[in-house]
């Protein structure tokens, strides 16, 4: 019995269906096929869980959180023992292992390993201003999404004809910050932050209005 090499890892957007491949070759009829899928969750590597079991011509449930969401992609018994996971959750991310036994066939590699990463688009980011908006001050524009896997990058732009930030601005796309030094009237305007990752984007807007000092009355 020989389990085929799997592609390594599967990526899927949260809520979508993941298909985890596992197939094997055997010299014996599929009369005594046993297949178990286990997961080592990324969130808790010390607490592996059973996902699904096929034994004695029957399917058995694994951990409660997989109930009703998991099944074999084809009619069992078969040499393709891939599974699907519906409505994928962030907690489904982990290392999945299929273990196959088909007596009397012995020997060979009877375990396959596939990683699953559940991707999450950036949630609507929050745009904030830190610092005084008085003329000549330094301000920091802050942008961050609570959710997003892979971790989002943040791109700030000024919503004017050029879409360019003021010349005194420096941007950190990882942290989601823009520092604008010595703000002037030209710094005023609408700024947009675009949070993006491999599977989506999300934006927020911020209105920066530079306050000019009031002329002193005599």
């Amino acid at each position: 019995l020989e389990v085929s090499e799997s592609p390594g890892s599967v990526q899927v957007a949260r809520g979508q269906t993941a298909v985890l491949p596992c197939a094997f070759s055997t010299s014996a009829a599929l009369l005594n096929l046993n297949v178990i899928w286990m997961v080592i969750p990324l969130s808790n590597a010390n607490q592996p869980e059973q996902v699904i079991l096929y034994q004695g011509g029957q399917m058995f449930d694994g951990a409660l959180r997989f109930h009703g969401r998991v099944g074999f992609t084809g009619t069992m018994p078969a040499t393709n023992v891939s599974i699907f996971i519906n409505n994928t959750q962030l907690s489904d991310t982990g290392t999945y292992q299929c273990l196959v036994n088909n007596l009397p066939d012995r020997g060979g590699r009877n375990i396959g390993v596939t990683g699953l990463t559940v991707l999450v688009p950036p949630s609507a980011p929050q745009c904030q201003i830190q610092g005084s908006q008085d003329l000549g001050s330094d301000v920091i524009l802050l942008c961050s999404s609570e959710e997003g896997i892979p971790r989002p990058t943040y791109l700030w732009e000024k919503l004017d004809n050029t879409l360019k930030l003021p010349p005194t601005a420096t941007q950190d796309q990882v942290q989601g910050t823009v520092t604008i030094r010595n703000i002037s009237a030209l710094s005023s305007g609408l700024y947009q932050c675009v949070a993006s990752n491999a599977i989506g984007t999300s934006t927020c807007l911020l209105d920066l209005q530079v306050i000019s000092p009031q002329p002193r009355s005599v």
């Epitope: 046993n34 297949v35 178990i36 286990m38 080592i40 592996p48 059973q50 079991l53 034994q55 004695g56 029957q58 058995f60 449930d61 951990a63 409660l64 292992q97 273990l99 036994n101 012995r106 009877n110 375990i111």
Partner: antibody
Framework: QVQLVQSGAEVKKPGSSVKVSCKAS????????ISWVRQAPGQGLEWMGG????????NYAQKFQGRVTITADESTSTAYMELSSLRSEDTAVYYC?????????????WGQGTLVTVSS | ETTLTQSPATLSVSPGERATLSCRAS??????IAWYQQKPGQAPRLLIY???TRATGIPARFSGSGSGTEFTLTISSLQSEDFAVYSC?????????FGQGTKVEIK
């Protein structure tokens, strides 16, 4: 023919730990789940958890989570069950058991049992 | 968790008679029920799995039936070696659970 041979009886103080071993012979060890089942005096059987040695990771009943550790050594075909923070209610015969397939389903091979007595 | 309730707790039967043991599950377990025999000082012995399939080497006088929540173990003609405690076990739901057992004693 599969045989499961367990370690001998133990007497332990409350609050201490006990580790019981179960050596398998006569079959493939790595791919089959070894479960641990206990039986208090005059009581029914109680499944504690199990391990599939090839995965090296165990599955526990919620009741014992955090207090029991089940491990396996493929090189010696031996499974272990360690129970910590012992109390008098843990006095029981502890059995290792193996089923015909991977999952902790039903058990057709049993060890002879290990009596663990918890007493001050 | 799935609770298995066995009845009666004790059954007094004469050798050669028929014994009928009941096991009720608190929730559906399909046909995923096993029956074990246990004698004093011994480990349990698997008799029946999948509700009605006899394990290897088990005499034909032992038979099982039922699905869902109601299960029965029948010993058609009790032999002297059959006096023991009989337990049911479900393997559909986690955790795996056992009934408290029915003691079959000589009348």
């Amino acid at each position: 023919q599969v045989q499961l041979v367990q370690s001998g009886a133990e007497v332990k103080k409350p609050g201490s730990s006990v580790k019981v071993s179960c050596k398998a012979s006569g079959g493939t060890f790595s791919s089959y789940a070894i479960s641990w089942v206990r039986q208090a005096p005059g009581q029914g059987l109680e499944w504690m958890g199990g391990i599939i040695p090839i995965f090296g990771t165990a599955n526990y009943a919620q009741k014992f989570q955090g207090r029991v550790t089940i491990t396996a050594d493929e090189s010696t075909s031996t499974a272990y069950m360690e129970l910590s923070s012992l109390r008098s209610e843990d006095t029981a015969v502890y059995y290792c058991a193996r089923g015909r397939g991977f999952g902790e389903l039903y058990f057709d091979y049993w060890g002879q049992g290990t009596l663990v007595t918890v007493s001050s | 968790e799935t609770t298995l309730t066995q009845s009666p707790a004790t059954l007094s039967v004469s050798p050669g008679e028929r014994a009928t043991l009941s096991c009720r599950a608190s929730q559906g377990v399909r046909s995923n029920i096993a029956w074990y025999q246990q004698k004093p000082g011994q480990a349990p012995r698997l008799l029946i799995y999948d509700s009605s399939t006899r394990a290897t080497g088990i005499p034909a006088r032992f038979s099982g039936s039922g699905s869902g929540t109601e299960f029965t173990l029948t010993i058609s003609s009790l032999q002297s070696e059959d006096f023991a405690v009989y337990s049911c076990q479900q393997y559909k739901n986690w955790p795996r659970t056992f009934g408290q057992g029915t003691k079959v004693e000589i009348k």
